[in-house]
């Protein structure tokens, strides 16, 4: 149920999660000068019954200077495939993002914490991605990306998220929106070129989710 | 139904104006960036022009550059390029265009001739 | 002259299998933009046939698949038909120009 690749890459973007799905893991990493503590918890997991879902495990980092032993704090080679690194992101889930049944908010900082966090995903995972500080996207409404398994494999599907220009940063979904300038910068910009692969167009009802120009024939 | 309709092409001198219009029609235009695309009889497809969502940023081929103004009137929902200073070699149908582009208009043909 | 390089022309049998290239640069597919594929038929305007380097819009036949490596891509058409016929375009978006890019276009001769 592990999500082989990682989401997909953007140029000029970055994405983050709202909420992660059950099963998620996110591996104890600790900031240089810092290790895991001996005998302490490799990764924290996203587990939980059918009303709650919460972060088991608790990751804790200690001075490596204390005492003279091997600093793993990555994964082992044969979980590389699984890993993905992201910019530590402080929590900030929308309310009906974060309350999904079957999915924990983002865990909060732990003291000595790595400035990256790396996750590993499983299916049915969407991550949402916004511009990087100094570009905007050409469409409005949110890119997002969702793990799916298909014939067995797994697979992220494409947000096409197109990046450009000297502009301002962007907000992610369920963030406050800028106030428009006398500049005209646009509402949104976490939107993308022609969106996801599910090419559906935008209709009032859906306005919440991915945006495409095309209609469900093209699904 | 997604359509895209083109209008305001024909026959114009060297150094003329003109104005093309672009009805779109089945989607929510006003949170997709919209582009000009050309080609030249007989030639490729060639990009023109891109403008965003809100119309508040917009970019045009080198060689439209300065003479040719991409705008949109989101309340409309149509799309405008302006074109002025007209050469020969503008002669071309021009594709009103949404998306990737991944949705075109049937086209509407420019021609710049004395 | 087109930012990215197709073979202007390619050609085959019924029932064979024929492969286009588009070939860009670190500017549009090698800063890794999705490629997209278009289909024209004589007089009408291009069509969207592959989306995202390999994605099929529903009702464009599996005959049809896309590939991207680097800075290059390629179209496959296998089971040709006589009805493929057309011109065929790649397109990228370029960070440079700040818009897409077009190959030149390849024309696809059912032989």
């Known amino acids: 149920e592990l999500c082989d690749d990682d989401p997909p890459e953007i140029p000029h973007a970055t994405f983050k999660a709202m909420a992660y799905k059950e099963g998620t893991m996110l591996n104890c990493e600790c900031k240089r000068g810092f290790r895991r503590i001996k005998s302490g918890s490799l990764y924290m997991l996203c587990t939980g019954n059918s009303s709650h879902s919460s972060w088991d495990n608790q990751c804790q980092c200690t001075s490596s200077a204390t005492r003279n032993t091997t600093k793993q704090v990555t994964p082992q080679p044969e979980e590389q495939k699984e890993r993905k690194t992201t910019e530590m992101q402080s929590p900030m889930q929308p309310v009906d993002q974060a309350s999904l049944p079957g999915h924990c908010r983002e865990p909060p900082p732990w003291e000595n914490e790595a400035t990256e966090r790396i996750y590993h995903f499983v299916v049915g995972q969407m991550v949402y991605y916004q511009c990087v500080q100094g570009y905007r996207a050409l469409h409005r409404g949110p890119a997002e990306s969702v793990c799916k398994m298909t014939h067995g494999k797994t697979r992220w599907t494409q947000p096409q998220l197109i990046c450009t220009g000297e502009m301002e940063t962007s907000q992610f979904p369920g963030e406050e929106k800028p106030q428009a300038s006398p500049e005209g910068r646009p509402e949104s910009e976490t939107s993308c070129l022609v969106t996801t692969t599910d090419f559906q167009i935008q209709t009032e009802m859906a306005a919440t989710m991915e945006t495409s120009i095309f209609t469900t024939e093209y699904q | 139904e997604v359509q895209l309709l083109e209008s305001g092409g024909g026959l114009v001198q060297p150094g003329g104006s003109l104005r093309l219009s672009c009805a779109a029609s089945g989607f929510t235009f006003s949170s997709y960036g919209m582009h000009w695309v050309r080609q030249a009889p007989g030639k490729g497809l060639e990009w023109v022009s891109v403008?965003?969502?809100?119309?508040?940023?917009?970019y045009y081929a080198d060689s439209v550059k300065g003479r040719f103004t991409i705008s949109r009137d989101n309340s409309k929902n149509t799309l405008y390029l302006q074109m002025n200073s007209l050469r020969a070699e503008d002669t071309a149908v021009y594709y009103c265009?949404?998306?990737?582009?991944?949705?075109w208009g049937q086209g509407t043909l420019v021609t710049v001739s004395s | 002259q087109s930012v990215l390089t197709q073979p202007p022309s390619a050609s085959g049998t019924p029932g064979q299998r024929v492969t286009i290239s588009c070939t860009g640069s670190s500017s549009n597919i090698g800063a890794g933009y999705d490629v997209h594929w278009y289909q024209q038929l004589p007089g009408t305007a291009p069509k969207l046939l592959i989306y995202s380097n390999n994605e099929r819009p529903s009702g464009v036949p599996d005959r049809f698949s896309g590939s991207k490596s680097g800075t290059s891509a390629s179209l496959a058409i296998s089971g040709l038909r006589s009805e493929d016929e057309a011109d065929y375009y790649c397109?990228?978006?370029?960070?440079?120009?700040?818009?897409?890019?077009f190959g030149g276009g390849t024309k696809l001769t059912v032989l």
């Open positions: 397109a990228a978006w370029d960070m440079s120009l700040n818009g897409p890019v």
């Open positions: 403008i965003s969502y809100d119309g508040s940023y917009k």
């Open positions: 265009a949404a998306g990737v582009p991944d949705y």
